[in-house]
Every structure is written in structure tokens, then in C-alpha cells.
């Protein structure tokens, strides 16, 4: 249950978060599961533990394996497992499936491609973006914070997109790359498995305490009239109406039919007077139709006055 897959490339930085969390004051111990050997905390080591984070600076193929993290709370020792695989760099341009993060789908209206895992790193804008190994150039492509925006999306924009950034640790720089597929839907009159355009999977949404915040769950279900389609929000796995927090309400948006004909729905989650404890909740955007259910999870983080890092 508390296990997480992580992967990276040799000679790049890889940072893994313990699947169990805890207060900053809690001690987190990391072990290499196969040998039960403790991971050092001294930063002079190439692989070291830093609280909830396990850092490979840089990673080596031999680092692959299962790592155990134990969060020592005042009552229980809470255990998580990080299954880490480090791959050799490919000589050709193709990115193998096992290095790919989740596929995102876009439309003319919504074409954000988020750089996976970037929030774990100490990086500075701008990001570099590549499509099928070619650096993206032209006014249609805009690197904004941790995502890429493509204007006037066309079917030809489908492909594998790689973000590249530099992680800085105590003055030393390490390269990180992450790749995910981007698909564009443009067939005639069809129904497909829901595609959540927003939020991105595991998105971190910045909010200000005391202010109001809106989260939009936007999903597309195909072209033309859809027999059954719905989008909704859940809080910690519970329906909004059952959660019982009057400050948090969902409000149905308008049915949208984009210029390329996609049938999409929006659901806006309105949080009035954001409180600290709202940052601890898990917000799930659910999209469902006859094909099935897709879920994207969002967490809130406090907006810092100066946003150096993701």
C-alpha cells in the first residue's frame, strides 16, 4: 500500500520521496532493503537521505533496488517502500516505455504538459523542452513554470515530450530529464476513456491562506453527444456533499464543445477562506463515462512570497 515506483537515468539526479509522510520534526530512517544497510545522511555521499527525501546525486545503475523508509512518529514506526530503478542512457533517440511517465491528452483549449516529479528538485526556471528529442522552437511553445503550453494544438503535436532541468545541491549541478507522451484527440463522433485535461496528475496548486481558491476539474469524453459523462471532486476519497465542510463546495461548469468538437465537462471546486488544514487534504478530480473512471490527485501548498523552486 505504501510503496512507490521511481526511476531515473544513470549520471542524472534522482530524488525519491518516502511514500509515508510525517511532521518535519519526525526522524526518517532509510535502508537499502536487500541488505538492511542504513543510508547515510551526510551530504558528501553520492546517495544520501535527507529527511523524507532519498537523493541519488548522481544515480548509478547499481543503485537499483527497494529502499525502505521508516518515519518514526511518537506512536508507530510507519514504513514505506521506494522501488528504484536506474537505467543506462540510450544511445538512440527513442525513450523506452519503462522511462515514460503518465500520458497526458490535450486539446486546442487545454495543452499543458507538466514536467513530472519536478517539485522534488531544487531547480530554477526556465525548463528546456524537447519533442521526440528535438529542442522545441517557435512562438507556439511556451515554457511556463513547471509546464509547457502549446498554442493552437494540432494532431501533429502528439508525441513524446521531454523536460530537462538542473538540480542544484550545495552549489553542485545535476541534470534531470523526464519524458511523457502527449496525445491529441481529433476523430469524428466517438466516445473514449475520460481524459482529464486539468488538473495534471499529482499537481501541486499554490494557494494563499485566508483567501479563496478555485480548482477546476476538466475532462473530455470524446466527440459529439455523450451518453454518460460526469466530472466531480472528492476530498480524501469522500464525496464533497458527504465531507461536511461548508467552506468547500463544487459548482458545475458549462458543457464545453471545443472548436475541434471534443465534448468536455468542467467542475469547479470552490474553497472559501483557505485554512492550513486544507493543505493536508487530498483533492481528487474524477472523470467517468461508460469506458471507466479516471482520477487525478491535487494537493495544495502555501504560496510563498518569492517562488524560487517548484
Amino acid at each position: 500500500k505504501f510503496s512507490k515506483q521511481s526511476w531515473g537515468l544513470e549520471n542524472e539526479a534522482l530524488i525519491v520521496r518516502c511514500p509515508r509522510q510525517g511532521k518535519p520534526s519526525y526522524t526518517v530512517d532509510w535502508y537499502y532493503s536487500q541488505t538492511n544497510k542504513s543510508i547515510p545522511t551526510q551530504e558528501r555521499n553520492r546517495v544520501f537521505a535527507s529527511g523524507q527525501l532519498l537523493k541519488f546525486l548522481p544515480a548509478a545503475v547499481a543503485d537499483s533496488g527497494i529502499y525502505t523508509c521508516i518515519v518514526r512518529s511518537p506512536t508507530f514506526n510507519r514504513t514505506g517502500y521506494a522501488n528504484v530503478t536506474i537505467y543506462k542512457k540510450q544511445s538512440d533517440c527513442n525513450v523506452p516505455d519503462y522511462l515514460m511517465y503518465s500520458t497526458v491528452s490535450g486539446s486546442e483549449k487545454n495543452s499543458k504538459i507538466y514536467c513530472p516529479t519536478i517539485d522534488l528538485y531544487n531547480w530554477t526556471a526556465p525548463l528546456e523542452w524537447f519533442k521526440n528529442c528535438q529542442a522545441l522552437q517557435g512562438s507556439r511553445y511556451r515554457a511556463h513554470k513547471s509546464f509547457l503550453v502549446i498554442d493552437n494544438v494540432m494532431t501533429e503535436d502528439a508525441g513524446d515530450y521531454t523536460c530537462k532541468f538542473i538540480h542544484n545541491e550545495n552549489g553542485a549541478n545535476y541534470s534531470v530529464t523526464a519524458t511523457r507522451s502527449f496525445t491529441v484527440k481529433d476523430e469524428q463522433g466517438f466516445s473514449l476513456f475520460p481524459v482529464i485535461g486539468a488538473p495534471a496528475q499529482n499537481e501541486i496548486k499554490e494557494v494563499e491562506i485566508g483567501k479563496n481558491a478555485n480548482l477546476t476539474c476538466s475532462a473530455c469524453f470524446g466527440k459529439g453527444t455523450q451518453f454518460l459523462a460526469a466530472v466531480l471532486w472528492q476530498l480524501n476519497g469522500t464525496k464533497i456533499t458527504d465531507f461536511g465542510e461548508p467552506r468547500i463546495q463544487q459548482e458545475e461548469g458549462q458543457n464545453q464543445s471545443f472548436s475541434n468538437g471534443l465534448a468536455c465537462l468542467d467542475m469547479v471546486l470552490r474553497i472559501a477562506d483557505v485554512k492550513e488544514e486544507d493543505l493536508l487534504l487530498q483533492y481528487d478530480c474524477l472523470a467517468l463515462n461508460l469506458h471507466g473512471l479516471r482520477r487525478h490527485t491535487v494537493r495544495l501548498s502555501r504560496k510563498n512570497p518569492i517562488d524560487h523552486h517548484s
Epitope: 500500500k1 509515508r20 509522510q21 510525517g22 511532521k23 520534526s25 518515519v71 512518529s73 511518537p74 506512536t75 508507530f76 510507519r78 480524501n236 476519497g237 469522500t238 458527504d242 492550513e276 488544514e277 493536508l280 487534504l281
Partner: antibody, heavy 121, light 106 residues
Framework: QVQLVQSGAEVKKPGASVKVSCKAS????????LHWVRQAPGQGLEWMGT????????VYNQKFKARVTMTADKSTSTAYMELSSLRSEDTAVYYC??????????????WGQGTLVTVSS | EIVMTQSPATLSLSPGERATLSCSVS?????MHWYQQKPGQAPRRLIY???KLASGIPARFSGSGSGTDYTLTISSLEPEDAAVYYC?????????FGGGTKVEIK
Amino acid sequence: QVQLVQSGAEVKKPGASVKVSCKASGYTFTDYELHWVRQAPGQGLEWMGTIDPETGDTVYNQKFKARVTMTADKSTSTAYMELSSLRSEDTAVYYCTRAFYNDYDDAFAYWGQGTLVTVSS
Amino acid sequence: EIVMTQSPATLSLSPGERATLSCSVSSSVSYMHWYQQKPGQAPRRLIYDTSKLASGIPARFSGSGSGTDYTLTISSLEPEDAAVYYCQQWNTSPLTFGGGTKVEIK
């Protein structure tokens, strides 16, 4: 809506045992540790211990360690607290309670309605 | 075991007045939680992690402190604030509560 519903009041004789139940709903039972807190009449709150329903692991307050047993039934999302060798000073309201967000131990946000246990000869 | 001492035992104030409740700890803790309890009811979470206001709690309640000394402040008392208030530490096992401060409204 998170709910913790406890069993009804009990009257026990000294030396007997009592088993209080706490049925959880509105969340995934195995994702949150459940704690037991008691309150004697006119007195303060006293933490008795906690159980991880996923594993059945327990941590007890040393004061009760010899007499308390906490268990959890995953199939019914119900936690139990059994206290043995009862004495008059065990007369109290017994609460089951849960943190708001488990891994952060951010105070007891959800409480059962309480179960009054009276120990009298 | 960490011993929590709350003072005063009873606080009697008029509506609109400021109430300051103290919680002293026998050894340093990282966080403090505060609860309100009214007769015949289960405790209610007021403040968690020293200063964070729980959902649905009015802004007149605030918490502060560090180390061994923590404070719950009610900036302007309302009649419905009459209750017993408890501090609690979750720093080490066993978890412990203070003896409580009873707030009376004149």
C-alpha cells in the same frame, strides 16, 4: 462524513472486564490509527493507547498496559477496547478518536460520542 | 512521561474580554494541540500544531508558543466560549493532556 459510533453504556462489577466498540464510517478504516481516550467524572482526559487497524499493531499507555487490549476488525471497520480487572476508579467515559490526517498526527479531529462505563459493586 | 500543567484552573471573565490560557510542559515539545469541551460533549479540536486554526473554529481563537510554554488566546470572549479547554502533546508516547482550564463567562 467521518463518523465514529460507539457502543452503549455498561455497568460492570469490580474485577470484571468490559469491551467497548467503535464503528468507523466515511473513510478507509485501515488508513488511520484509532486512539482511545478516557475521562473520569469531573476529571481531565487520559490517553490509553492506539491501534493501527491495517496491521493490528498497538501502542499502549504504560499505565494500562497490563489490563488493556485493543483490536480491530477490518471486515466491519470496527475497533474494540477491552479493559480487564475493573476497579471503581475505571468509571469513566471512554472515547475512540482519530487524527485529521494520519501521518501528520495533527490532533484528534474526530471523536466517538463516548461510552460511559460504570464500575460498581 | 511528559507532564502538562495548565493555568489558571478557572478563568472568569466578561463577554468581550481577552482570555489567555497557559500550558506548561515538563520537557520541550515541538507542537501543541488545544481542545474545547462542553458538558456532556466530546472534546472538539480547536488549534493544532501550536497555531493552526481547525476547520469551523472562529478566528478569535489563536495559539502560540514553543518549547515548554504554550498559550491559547481568545481575543474577545463570547458567551458560547464557556467550556473547559485542554492542551495536548503528541511529541512522545504516552500522549498526555493538561488538567484543563475552565472558562466561565460572567
